[in-house]
Amino acid sequence: QGGTRSPRCDCAGDFHKKIGLFCCRGCPAGHYLKAPCTEPCGNSTCL
């Protein structure tokens, strides 16, 4: 699916993981995910 591509989040910086459609920056400790990011390597909405 999608041809040859890296099977990991290829985003600048750490703490990105695949959530839904995109690799998103994860939530800080003590926070939870309200909504995933809406662009590749974007920021999740955390509470």
Epitope: R5, D10, T38, P40
Partner: antibody, heavy 123, light 111 residues
Framework: EVQLVESGGGLVEPGGSLKLSCAAS????????MSWVRQSPEKRLEWVAE????????YYPDIVTGRFTISRDDAKNTLFLEMSSLRSEDTAIYYC????????????????WGQGTSVTVSS | DIVLTQSPASLAVSLGQRATISCRAS??????????MQWYQQKPGQPPKLLIY???NVESGVPARFSGRGSGPDFSLNIHPVEEDDIAMYFC?????????FGGGTKLEIK
Amino acid sequence: EVQLVESGGGLVEPGGSLKLSCAASGFTFSTYAMSWVRQSPEKRLEWVAEISSGDSYTYYPDIVTGRFTISRDDAKNTLFLEMSSLRSEDTAIYYCVRDQDYRYDGYYAMDHWGQGTSVTVSS
Amino acid sequence: DIVLTQSPASLAVSLGQRATISCRASESVEHYGTSLMQWYQQKPGQPPKLLIYAASNVESGVPARFSGRGSGPDFSLNIHPVEEDDIAMYFCQQSRRIPWTFGGGTKLEIK
């Protein structure tokens, strides 16, 4: 051969509800993100919903948020779109679309489209 | 939302000549060196069909007379030489950010 067959369209009064279905075959449905895209009578294309593979996160534009719900049944290779509080501007042909991912971090193109099902909202 | 403006709205080209359709985004659709822009063809009575992805990659099975180019916010689709079978509507679409958006379409006709 990839096939996407929509059903469930029809005539509905403003404020009414409708549930569209899309039967998928010819590919491993569970591994693909899927979308619904509609085309107005004026031929304008508008993306209205998407669901990711695996974790089934859902995404909508503001214009349908709270009114439309996309879901999938991977066991039955079927995609759904539940529409409520329908308005005249929701009148369109609704296409079921497969989303091919070209980058793991999230780049998608709509590489296969069904023939569409027509929805008319009118009193 | 990223707005895509296509031009011209309609285009009449002689058989064998070149057709060029433009698409301008309200902001860049680049992501780490990839232009997240697609082109689709829609013939009368049919659903859209993917022609070009990532601005310049031709989808499998699409004739070589179709090509795409561009970067940042400015993109174009070229058809050369134009054939009768190319009579259709053409749409650009961005995948840089949700909501995915489409251009208003360009109708290609034969002169």
